[in-house]
């Protein structure tokens, strides 16, 4: 209350970028912190399935849009057959889990492996058979899976015949996928994630063109996508609600990706509203028909008349409340390149505390769970990166310190990314791994990197001890 | 630098059609909407219609629903706008602008066009 | 259609005044409103967007403010290259309508 009488804003999070230390949530005084997550407090990693699986067209595997796009647009990326050889690997990967000691593995199926040209029909036995054998082993380690259904690998005859995300068609085809998913996992899996980072989905995939299917500066399409996800994602969080909650008793959400961004001059209005903007219109996107009232944030919906989609008043009251918590992603891929429109002349920033303040005050303070956060290291580093030591350091001290100075509700956090992989558009320029794999060699060793051992004690120590 | 360049003055007989064309340069052209906006000489601008160069798909005002059609072609980055069954008071000056997302508003406009419909 | 009606519709003002053009809207547009400048024998140029958002190159001189239905434009120091017409437009609702101007010249 105190907060709106003060700042004159209805609680939203403009305070966040309210320099006066009386009424801002974020201390800058607080640099570190060394304290202790809460007990219990959720450690995991997390992959996604084209990045690490390799394997495109083996056993049955149909294409996705992404094995396309890297043949058709990356011309310096044969495929992602290399990779990690995850399906190949997998108790290697398995090991390398043990050795962080995880409380969690976050990882996505890839909706091709288990139906090659997307329709549910009979799953493919040997993909059917991966997934079930990932998480066999995950429940005997006590590795609570956390499973996304979707991390923009879709079955490239989606593409071709319905035009993929922008045909609404798809929200069903997708809801099939999602039921056979509850049916044949939902006795191991607790935690569903439908839908990873749908903005870059949406933009990058029919806006800038760098992700597939590469579509360029069609925004009308660039938010048809978005619409269509969104309603997907609702589709199935009722699906589960309605008929597996009851006896699977799990929870489900959708990870929604951003960046952060600080004022030029931090006591202007105009740059504090700009920042306000450029936050609604990736983060508030999503987040506010789903987290939020059931609509599009009421600036975008002013300004992008011709573009937006319109919710009904019935589909309003569908999409609200269409998730058990709010699942956050913060890393490379919402800040390079990140959307010059979204940016609105404002710096971009990497204070994770602040978007999470942000969060709690749009939001009315979610549990949330940090579904992907890390940083990068160019291709060449092996298993010396202190860059992602120091990265890693300073967000978890941005989250205990959200945690505990700031009384938001994070209960989990999922450092990215387990392995090195294919990283979208950078291909193999970089790596996220925790564990460095020599994606030349046959065998593809996972070998923990500096990273690996820091988290790893992280973890030991549930936070920092002096 | 954004331009928006358009056709010249033109005089209709009433029940005559005329079309406008606008050439943009200096951004990507199916990135951003245009719009249509006249102006009578001593009034204020009145807002016609807006256009996705991307798709082509079109909005109009009420008042001049069934009488406005807006179009493009991409290859040569031009918007046109065409008004038939002219009448005396479609007399004006006739803008295509550039509508910027972020702003919800018109940061580029072309020239103007003088349409007189005179008998 | 919402109605946007501007007042006065013409002032003289001597340069270095403090100029304050007002602008109403026929009912609540919360914030979506911009403010052009229109020049004789030229296309209106964006001086506003968002009620109080100065765009690109717009001089420091020229503010916005207001919410709702009552919207105010000011010049904190009229200079002579300031003589123009001004409109108010609002895009809360389609169709997009304008103000009929305020003319502003100097005494």
């Known amino acids: 209350i105190l907060l709106r009488a003060v700042t004159g804003f209805s609680g939203d999070g403009r305070a966040i970028w309210s320099k006066n230390p009386n009424f801002t949530p974020v201390n800058e005084s607080q640099l570190f912190l060394y304290d202790t997550f809460p007990k219990n407090f959720f450690w995991g990693i997390g992959t996604g399935a084209l990045q690490v699986e390799g394997s495109w067209k083996k056993d049955g595997k149909g294409p996705s849009i992404w094995d396309h796009f890297i043949h058709t647009h990356l011309k310096n990326v044969s495929s992602t057959n290399g990779s990690s050889d995850s399906y190949i690997f997998l108790e290697k990967d398995l090991s390398a889990l043990d050795f962080i000691g995880v409380s969690f593995y976050q990882f996505s199926i890839s909706w091709p492996r288990l139906f090659p040209d997307g329709i549910v029909t009979v799953a493919n036995a040997k993909g059917l058979q991966y997934y079930s054998t990932l998480l066999d082993a995950l429940v005997l380690r006590n590795i609570e899976p956390i499973v996304t259904l979707y991390h923009w690998d879709l079955p490239l005859a989606l593409q071709e015949k319905y035009g993929g995300w922008k045909n609404d068609t798809i929200i069903d085809i997708f809801n099939d996928y999602a039921t056979y998913c509850f049916q044949m996992f939902g006795d191991r899996v607790k935690y569903w994630i439908t839908i990873h980072n749908p903005y870059l989905v949406a933009w990058h995939g029919y806006g800038t063109g760098m992700h597939a299917p590469g579509e360029k500066g069609n925004l009308a399409a660039v938010y048809t996508v978005g619409h269509n996800l969104i309603k997907a994602h609702s589709k199935v969080w009722h699906n589960y609600n309605t008929h597996f909650r009851p006896h699977q008793k799990g929870w489900l959400s959708i990870t929604l990706g951003s960046h952060w961004i600080e004022p030029n001059r931090s006591e202007n209005t105009m740059d504090i509203f700009k920042c306000q903007q450029s936050m609604v219109s990736v983060l508030g996107w999503f987040a506010n028909p789903i987290h939020g009232d059931g609509d599009y944030p009421e600036g975008m919906r002013k300004k992008l008349f011709s573009v937006l989609p319109i919710f009904s008043e019935a589909e309003k009251h569908e999409m609200r409340g269409t998730a058990d918590f709010f699942a956050f992603s913060f890393g490379p891929n919402n800040f390079k390149p990140l959307n010059t429109m979204a940016k609105m002349g404002q710096n971009v920033s990497l204070n994770l505390r602040e978007a999470l303040n942000w969060i709690k005050l749009e939001y009315n303070n979610p549990r949330i769970l940090i579904a992907e956060n890390g940083w990068f290291t160019d291709s060449r580093v092996k298993t010396e990166d202190t860059t992602a030591i120091y990265m890693m350091k300073n967000f978890l001290s941005q989250v205990l310190q959200a945690i505990r100075l700031d009384e938001i509700r994070v209960f989990g956090y999922t450092a990215w990314s387990l392995l090195d992989g294919f990283e979208w558009q950078d291909a193999y320029t970089i790596r996220r791994g925790l564990f460095y794999v020599d994606f030349n060699s046959k065998q593809k060793e996972r070998k923990p990197k500096s990273s690996a051992h820091y988290y790893k004690q992280i973890i030991r120590e549930n936070g920092f001890s002096l | 630098q954004v331009q928006l360049v358009q056709s010249g003055a033109e005089v209709k007989k009433p029940g005559a059609s005329v079309k406008v064309s606008c050439m943009a340069s200096?951004?990507?052209?199916?990135?951003?909407?245009i719009n249509w906006v006249r102006q009578a000489t001593g009034q204020g601008p009145e807002w016609m219609g807006w256009?996705?160069?991307?798709?082509?798909?079109?909005g109009y005002a009420q008042n001049f629903q069934g009488r406005v059609t807006m179009t493009r072609d991409t290859s040569i980055n031009t918007a046109y706008m065409e008004l038939s069954s002219l009448r005396s008071e479609d007399t004006a000056v006739y803008y295509c602008?550039?509508?910027?997302?972020?702003?919800?508003?018109?940061?580029?406009w072309g020239q103007g066009t003088m349409v007189t419909v005179s008998s | 259609d919402i109605q946007m009606t501007q007042s006065p519709s013409s002032l003289s003002a001597s340069v270095g005044d403090r100029v304050t053009i007002t602008c109403q809207a026929s009912?609540?547009?919360?914030?979506?409103l911009n403010w052009y400048q229109q020049k004789p024998g030229k296309a209106p140029k964006l001086l506003i967007y968002?009620?109080?958002i100065l765009e690109t190159g717009v001089p420091s001189r020229f503010s916005g403010s207001g919410s709702g239905t009552d919207f105010t434009l000011t010049i904190s120091s009229l200079q002579p290259e300031d003589i123009a017409t001004y409109y108010c437009?609002?895009?809360?609702?389609?169709?997009?309508?304008f103000g009929q101007g305020t003319r502003l010249e100097i005494k």
């Open positions: 602008a550039k509508y910027n997302w972020n702003y919800g508003a018109f940061d580029f």
């Open positions: 200096g951004y990507i052209f199916t990135s951003y909407d």
């Open positions: 009912q609540d547009i919360t914030k979506y």
């Open positions: 256009m996705n160069p991307y798709s082509g798909s079109t």
């Open positions: 968002d009620t109080f």
């Open positions: 437009q609002q895009y809360d609702n389609l169709p997009l309508t």
